[in-house]
Structures are given as structure tokens and as C-alpha cells.
């Protein structure tokens, strides 16, 4: 294959983007490399330039079309190649057949907003971005709430086992600042993984009502 240990990992966002990371121990940082995508049943092909993200890894996004266009289906197979320049020619470093709908990672949910907030609860909604209509309702979500004095890693995960783009957070403390994040995952796919977490939504619960005698 290639000298040193190499890894080539790609994910499809279900619409018009394949994001790839290629890593190789001992590779030169200034090496010029590309990813080429050749679908088995499409007339187009696409290339992106791998750019360094760390000492021994490179990443790029194959932009297949307009963000919401459905460029691939469940029956497509895309041959992905990593090519690196050696002098005047390109050398193939890796070849992978990639089934897009077995390797899904959606975009992070967007448009988070507070629908209604009270002293002890808060209703939040969001939208999914650039997600294929093929999923219909076959999506799940994870959410987490950052409480004062805690880290995101400590926040318990709330699982929504259906396509539900809202949540009602309960047992909150009055007059307290919180942050909320959500991520999404399709139910299908051998290597399908969670989307990145959404941008955090900050909100504050309402203060407790003052007693009549105070």
C-alpha cells in the first residue's frame, strides 16, 4: 500500500458533500495531495485539495453540487482516491469504494430557539440542515444542557429516538443561565455517526415569583 500507517476516512452529509480525512505517519507536511471522487453511475466526478489539519493528517470537502441537491442515492458507490504529487506526476496513495448511505454524518442542527421559558422548564426547537428526504422520519437526536459550574462532558445526554425537532427541558433552576446543544444521526448505515454538536443556545430561566408577603 503505502509506507507508514495510513488512514482514509470519509463521510457523506446525505446531500451534496463528502468530507474526507487522510492521515499518514511520516508524510511530509508540504506534500500536495487531492481526493478524487468517481461515482459508478453518475456523469460527474469531483476533486478537492487536502489541506493539513495536524502534523500528519489532511482534510477536504468534496462539494458535489448545491447544498440541498440530492447528488447521491442509496445504490450509488463512489470510488475515492487519494493522489499525491511526486515531481511532475501524481501517485495514487489509497483507493476506497465508498457507499455514501453507509457512511453518513449529517450537518449540525441549526436555528435553535427558545419557544417558551418558565422558572423550571424551557421548550427549545431546532431544524436539521441539508438532510436527505430519503430519511423520512428515520432520524434520532441527542441533546445536552450545560448547567452552571459544569462542563459539556459532564452534561447528561438526552436521547430522542425519533424525528422530534423540539424538547421540553424540565427541573431547571429558576433565574439560572444555561446552554443547550443538539446533534442528529440517521438510523441507517454501517459507519453512520453523529453529526457535530449544534452551536450552543444560551437561555435563562425566569426568576421564581416573589411571595405575597415579601
Amino acid at each position: 500500500a503505502v509506507n507508514g500507517t495510513s488512514q482514509f476516512t470519509c463521510f457523506y452529509n446525505s446531500r451534496a458533500n463528502i468530507s474526507c480525512v487522510w492521515s499518514q505517519d511520516g508524510a511530509l507536511q508540504d506534500t500536495s495531495c487531492q481526493v478524487h471522487a468517481w461515482p459508478d453511475r453518475r456523469r460527474w466526478n469531483q476533486t478537492c485539495e487536502l489541506l493539513p489539519v495536524s502534523q500528519a493528517s489532511w482534510a477536504c470537502n468534496l462539494i458535489l453540487g448545491a447544498p440541498d441537491s440530492q447528488k447521491l442515492t442509496t445504490v450509488d458507490i463512489v470510488t475515492l482516491r487519494v493522489l499525491c504529487r511526486e515531481g511532475v506526476r501524481w501517485r495514487v496513495m489509497a483507493i476506497q469504494d465508498f457507499k455514501p448511505f453507509e457512511n453518513l454524518r449529517l450537518m449540525a442542527p441549526i436555528s435553535l430557539q427558545v419557544v417558551h421559558v418558565e422558572t423550571h422548564r424551557c421548550n427549545i426547537s431546532w431544524e436539521i440542515s441539508q438532510a436527505s428526504h430519503y430519511f423520512e422520519r428515520h432520524l434520532e437526536f441527542e441533546a445536552r444542557t450545560l448547567s452552571p459550574g459544569h462542563t459539556w462532558e459532564e452534561a447528561p445526554l438526552l436521547t430522542l429516538k425519533q424525528k422530534q425537532e423540539w424538547i421540553c427541558l424540565e427541573t431547571l433552576t429558576p433565574d439560572t443561565q444555561y446552554e443547550f446543544q443538539v446533534r442528529v444521526k440517521p438510523l441507517q448505515g454501517e459507519f453512520t455517526t453523529w453529526s457535530p454538536w449544534s452551536q450552543p443556545l444560551a437561555f435563562r430561566t425566569k426568576p421564581a415569583a416573589l411571595g405575597k408577603d415579601t
Epitope: 500507517t5 488512514q7 476516512t9 489509497a94 476506497q96 465508498f98 457507499k99 453507509e102 454501517e190 459507519f191
Partner: nanobody
Amino acid sequence: QVQLVESGGGLVQAGDSLRLSCATSGLTFSSYALGWFRQAPGKKREFVAATTRGGGRTMYAVSTEGRFTCSRDNDKNTVYLLMNSLKPKDTAVYYCAAMTSYYSGTYYPDSSDFDIWGQGTQVTVSS
């Protein structure tokens, strides 16, 4: 007893195609990553292709130049290797192999990663 049985080899002309099959028995097929290796006379065994348990990713040796396609049919407990535009340098004994450990399909596995091997099928490409 676990068995991998290759078939489909033979003598072909340069430029022809050939499809190798590897039928398995005695194992839970969908729990195994599967691969193809080849060994030419006087040379060491060489990686050709490997596919993950569900077939979502398949890695190919650079030497295949995109001429080979590895696929699996989890209903028929069979893995295939379609070889197009064959060249004399493709002449070798082709082996099917199964890997019990998890394979992500993102790197080139070594022959030592595979636990179960078939007996091989001879492919000869004449010029």
C-alpha cells in the same frame, strides 16, 4: 467447520475479465470482514482488496489501478472479486480470507490480520 472456497479462476487473455467467487460456510458471514490476496510465483502474498462486514467501505491495493471490484452478498454468504482489463502481471493464485476482528475499511490490512483462509484459485493471464 469453517470453510472458504474460491472458484472462478482460469486462463484468460490480456484485456479479458474474470469474476472470482468465495463461498463461505460454518461462520456468521455478516460478522466478518473479507479480503482477497494474491501470490505470484516466487513472490510474497500481496493484498488485493478488503471489504467491511456490511460492505460500506472497501479498500483496494493501489496496484489494482481501479480495475478490480470487490463486493459481498450477505444473503448468499459469498464475496466476489470482479477483475477487468486483466494483465499478465495479474497472474497469481488468488486467496479469499476472513477477519474475525473489527475492520473499519479505512486502512490497508496486513495478511496477519486475517484468521481464516481459502485454498486459493489460479488465475493466469496470457499476452
